[in-house]
């Protein structure tokens, strides 16, 4: 949560001389209450906009717009405090509109905008517009708040922003998961144009339950340049565990721009519909594919085995 770097923050408009200042989120009128205070904003509109920074990065910003009520209290309106609270971190950022001239009624409703709060993908924010001075203790509140959820990087508008591109948003793995005989899944996905490794996490769940009954991790080494954009096929061997039939496959890339924090893509295989006559399940499923001449554990994650190849 930050302010867009290079913009001259302007709030003046015809009939009003105004300046935008950084704020501590604690206006002086909290400490020294005034007798006469303005009413609250009439409406707040928030939408997402994309702006470029002085370094040429595209970043998501909140476009905040609000209007004034048409009452005499605008004569006592000295400005506004805009506050943005990131809900999952409780981080808050404020700016203050300081009116350098008195507001007068004119033929149109007064309208104000601010588009300089830089936000993060897939985060929820509470935006508050507080008219100044703030009300006396026990006075009627003169602020309005609205929550806004910034879309995640899957959203077409967000995909092209710098934070999303840095986390791998342009990569569409187009995952397909196919159930094979003998308790196996074939996972297929498209490799990106970077020589970096991938990790596949298979998590299995019982039907209708959310605690996992089996988890297996498979490592895919970095592809060679001629394999970029090709399909990679991985066969994962499942454990034959009672009722452990719903499988989620998650692919985590390790691109240089995002390392451990790249966007992960997943696909799910539902439990099969119960046939009228259940098919017999093989009674034995090896814990790992045996290595020749060894009864050691497969050097991979919890119980599962896998192999992969790339398709041109």
């Amino acid at each position: 949560l930050r302010l867009l770097d290079h913009r001259a923050l302007v709030c003046s408009q015809p009939g009003l001389n105004c300046t935008v200042k950084n704020s501590t989120c604690l206006d002086d009128s909290w400490i020294h209450p005034r007798n006469l205070t303005p009413s609250s904003p009439k409406n707040i509109y928030i939408n997402l906009s994309v702006s470029s920074t002085q370094h040429g990065e595209l970043v998501p910003v909140l476009h905040v717009e609000w209007t004034l009520q048409t009452d005499a209290s605008i004569l006592y309106l000295e400005g506004a405090e805009l506050s943005v609270l990131q809900l999952n971190t409780n981080e808050r950022l404020c700016v203050r509109f300081e009116f350098l001239s008195k507001l007068r009624h004119h033929h149109r409703r007064w309208r104000f905008t601010f588009s300089h709060f830089v936000v993060d993908p897939d985060q929820e924010y509470e935006v508050t517009v507080h008219h100044l001075p703030k009300p006396i203790p026990d006075g009627d509140p003169n602020h309005q708040s609205k929550n806004f959820l910034v879309p995640d990087c899957e959203h077409a508008r967000m995909k092209v922003t710098t934070p999303c591109m840095s986390s791998g948003s342009l990569w569409d793995p187009n995952i397909t998961v196919e159930t094979l005989e003998a308790h196996q899944l074939r996972v297929s996905f498209t490799l990106w144009n970077e020589s970096t490794h991938y990790q596949i996490l298979l998590t299995s769940f019982p039907h209708m339950e959310n605690h996992s009954c089996f988890e297996h991790m498979h490592h895919i080494p970095a592809p060679r340049p001629e394999e970029f954009h090709q399909r990679s096929n991985v066969t994962l061997t499942l454990r034959n565990l009672k009722g452990c039939c719903r499988h989620q496959v998650q692919i985590q890339p390790f691109f240089s721009s995002c390392l451990n924090d790249c966007l992960r893509h997943s696909a799910t295989v539902s439990c099969p519909e119960m046939p009228d006559t259940p098919e017999p399940i093989p009674d034995y499923m090896p814990l790992w594919e045996p290595r020749s001449g060894s009864s050691d554990y497969k050097d991979d994650d919890d119980k599962g085995s896998s192999h992969h190849h790339h398709h041109h």
Partner: antibody, heavy 116, light 107 residues
Amino acid sequence: QVQLVQSGAEVKKPGASVKVSCKASGYTFTRYGISWVRQAPGQGLEWMGWISTYSGNTNYAQKLQGRVTMTTDTSTSTAYMELRSLRSDDTAVYYCARRQLYFDYWGQGTLVTVSS
Amino acid sequence: EIVMTQSPATLSVSPGERATLSCRASQSVSSNLAWFQQKPGQAPRPLIYDASTRATGVPARFSGSGSGTDFTLTISSLQSEDFAVYYCQQYDNWPLTFGGGTKVEIK
């Protein structure tokens, strides 16, 4: 070589909480889940639950649900098991073990004594 | 939950003799069964997984067999270091459960 080293013995009063740690070394921590098993004095082994060191998924024994929390700190390759509202029948040696279903390496055990 | 029953509770055997330990599941656990050895004051040591596969470093005198509900751990010629308590454990279904143990003592 693979090692799981647990924190030292604890004496707690009924109603208190205990948090046992299990530091892993000799392998990639996030590749294998950590399970917890306990053994009351002179008794058999009892499975308590499991945590995925990669995803954080957990699966707890029904009888401990609501009292037990398993966590991991991947930066230090350490797993933790916290048991709350301790009772005298929670007196046991608590073991961490590697893997989810079948346990190939075990910690040395931590004796937790619950006594007023 | 699946109940694992081990028998006998105590087995008295002379060194060099064969020991046969039994483990029965209350319902089929396929071959998802492990055996552990535990000595006093020590953590359990893995012996067998998948009902019959020996774990790393386990001597060939230990062998496991069975599938479904009935399993056996056989120690072909007991050595002095084999006197201990042996546990079976199923991992076919949650919660994972252990048998009550069989104590193998010197006759």
